[in-house]
Interface confidence: medium
């Protein structure tokens, strides 16, 4: 038995374009919870298969509403963590589906209104007792980050939760033929005391006081063999006596739980009980080793000689978690300088680099001007990654090669005209304007019009100007 | 496309009574088993009652027997979960829910709820 814990670290807009709007408004506040569904195994499950190792709704978010014109935030969540309880053994392999509800909380007739806003799926390896495992998923241009864990619950202890541990009676070593519970060499393997009475061949417990019972077999101490003709009534309930079968398709109906697994009926499916060895949604795998190869990506698998003893996956540059089965964001740290582009190419690390910049993480700031003349007088200026010339007056262009035509721009104010000159360009005013592009006005008495007006006089009326 | 609609949730005085329908679409309620399953605030979900329409067989959680009743009328491909003596402890959002049943490796068999509408909000207060 054991918990899966999630813990959601944040919700909110994707990197890159499009920032999604805000799910909530002033017209209509908003608040958000998640779900989790969890299922056995890593095979690529359809959205609405049952979440058969369990599932869990987070409380709801505080109130949000969105800031007229603002991108959406992070947005605000809930407290604490989503804990989904497995009562049997940890699989080890599992898929996840993360989902993002938004409550609505505007004046809707008959309640609040809910709404998917992102799902996010994967799968994983994960062995219990391990540290947090951090993720980040991506659902258009939503992005969740999150952390999980499966943890035991005592006494059961080890990668899936099977083993069973109490401590030491005695200081120096374990009861007869049982072991240490390692890595808690001061406990012990507990031995189990089934229920009285249970059958020897035909039970089994996994908690002491407990008798469960293997396929074909029922009845409280797992003595009456199971006949599915002595129903008498066609909806009658089980019966120890007769042995007597539920009529109906029920979750446990021809028990699906294997190696000695036994079944009982959940909200949403059914949980088998497996004996120690053995975990899975049907108890139909025995505890992982090395040779079924669980690490990812190229890892080496060390260790996990019996299924009772741990392995350990030794991950290759650029992978990590227990299984190497996350790949590292290597560009995160941002480790291309001077605005280089970083590629993570899982083998290997490429920065990609501004002009001007070089070395493999762009750390090398080039001499633009080395090698490179500007010509007719000009002078190469540096900056950003690209050399510029300060060309002589009456040239330009990028390398000052290009004979600068001054009056292209039309600088003579008010119709004057343009004359291109050796030392620059020279105005020639239409009458009634002066200065050296013709901005300035000539009053008819032949005094300037200066642009501001003298002392006691109010700007603005020109008639007044001496 | 399977969908489940239900309707009949609101507001209630403890000890009062209210029915919950269960429109089916998209599938014959024959062919499945059907439960109500509800999700309480802080709590986890319970299934509350189920029926395999074709023999009438019904399984109810301990927490509802003898005031709950679920029922199913296969010509109108429906489902209904008459609810009676509610108290405080019943309110919650109660969904319909499908129950597949198929045949796993030869021998034994998988089960599990596959689809569920979008739930409807019984309330139980003075």
């Known amino acids: 038995a054991g918990v899966f814990e999630l813990q959601i670290h944040s919700f909110g807009p994707g990197p890159g374009p499009g920032a999604p709007r805000s799910p909530c408004s002033a017209r209509l506040p908003c608040r958000l919870f998640f779900r989790v569904c969890l299922k056995p195994g890593l095979s690529e499950e359809a959205a609405e298969s049952p979440c058969a190792l369990g599932a869990a709704l987070s409380a709801r978010g505080p109130v949000y509403t969105e800031q007229p014109g603002a991108p959406a935030p992070d947005l605000p969540l809930p407290d604490g963590l989503l804990q989904v309880p497995f009562r049997d053994a940890w699989p080890g392999t599992f898929s996840f589906i993360i989902e993002t509800w938004r409550e609505e909380l505007g004046d809707q007739i008959g309640g609040p209104a809910w709404s998917l806003l992102a799902r996010v799926a994967g799968r994983r390896r994960l062995a219990a007792g391990g540290p947090w495992a951090r993720d980040i998923q991506r659902a258009g241009a939503w992005e969740l980050r999150f952390s999980y864990r499966a943890r035991c619950e005592p006494p059961a202890v080890g990668t899936a939760c099977t083993r069973l541990c109490r401590p030491r009676s005695a200081p120096s070593r374990c009861g007869p033929g049982l072991r240490p519970c390692a890595p808690l060499e001061d406990e012990c393997e507990a031995p189990l005391v089934c229920r009285a009475g249970c059958s020897p061949e035909h039970g089994f417990c996994e908690q002491p006081g407990e008798c469960r019972c293997l396929e074909g077999w029922t009845g409280p101490l797992c003595t009456v063999p199971v006949s599915t003709s002595s129903c008498l009534s066609p909806r009658g309930p089980s019966s120890a006596t007769t042995g007597c079968l539920v009529p109906g398709p029920g979750p446990c109906d021809g028990n699906p739980c294997a190696n000695g697994g036994s079944c009982s009926e959940t909200p949403r499916s059914f949980e088998c009980t497996c004996p120690r060895g053995f975990y899975g949604l049907r108890c139909e795998v025995s505890g992982v080793t090395c040779a079924d190869g669980p690490c990812f990506n190229g890892g080496l698998c060390v260790g996990g000689a019996d299924p009772d003893s741990a392995y350990i996956c030794h991950c290759p540059p650029g992978f990590q978690g227990s299984n190497c089965e996350k790949r590292v964001d290597r560009c995160s740290l941002q480790p291309c300088r001077n605005g280089g582009l970083c590629l993570d190419l899982g083998h290997a690390l490429r920065c990609r680099c501004r002009a001007g910049f070089a070395g493999p993480r762009c750390e090398h700031d080039l001499d633009d001007c080395a090698g490179r003349a500007c010509a007719n007088g000009g002078t190469c200026v540096e900056g950003g990654g690209a050399h510029r010339c300060s060309c002589a007056l009456g040239f330009g262009g990028r390398d000052c090669r290009e004979r600068a035509d001054p009056c292209a721009a039309r600088p003579c104010a008010h119709g004057g005209r343009c004359y291109a000159h050796f030392s620059g360009l020279v105005c020639a005013c239409a009458p009634g304007y002066m200065g050296a592009r013709c901005e300035f006005p000539v009053h008819p008495d032949g005094a300037s019009a200066l642009p501001a007006a003298p002392p006691g006089l109010r700007p603005g009326d020109p008639q007044r100007y001496l | 496309e399977v969908q489940l609609v239900e309707s009949g949730g609101g507001l209630v005085q403890p000890g009062g009574s209210l029915r919950l329908s269960c429109a089916a679409s998209g599938f014959n309620i024959s062919h499945y088993s059907i439960g109500w399953v509800r999700h309480a605030p802080g709590k986890g979900e319970e299934l509350v009652a189920r029926i395999y329409p074709t023999n009438g067989y019904t399984r109810y959680a301990d927490s509802v027997k003898g005031r709950f009743t679920i029922s199913a009328d296969t010509s109108k491909n429906t489902a209904y979960l008459q609810m009676n003596s509610l108290r405080a402890e019943d309110t919650a959002v109660y969904y319909c829910?499908?129950?597949?049943?198929?045949?796993?490796?030869?021998?034994?068999?998988?089960?599990?709820?596959?689809?569920s509408g979008q739930g409807t909000l019984v309330t139980v207060s003075s």
């Open positions: 829910a499908r129950h597949h049943y198929s045949h796993y490796d030869g021998h034994s068999h998988y089960y599990g709820l596959d689809y």
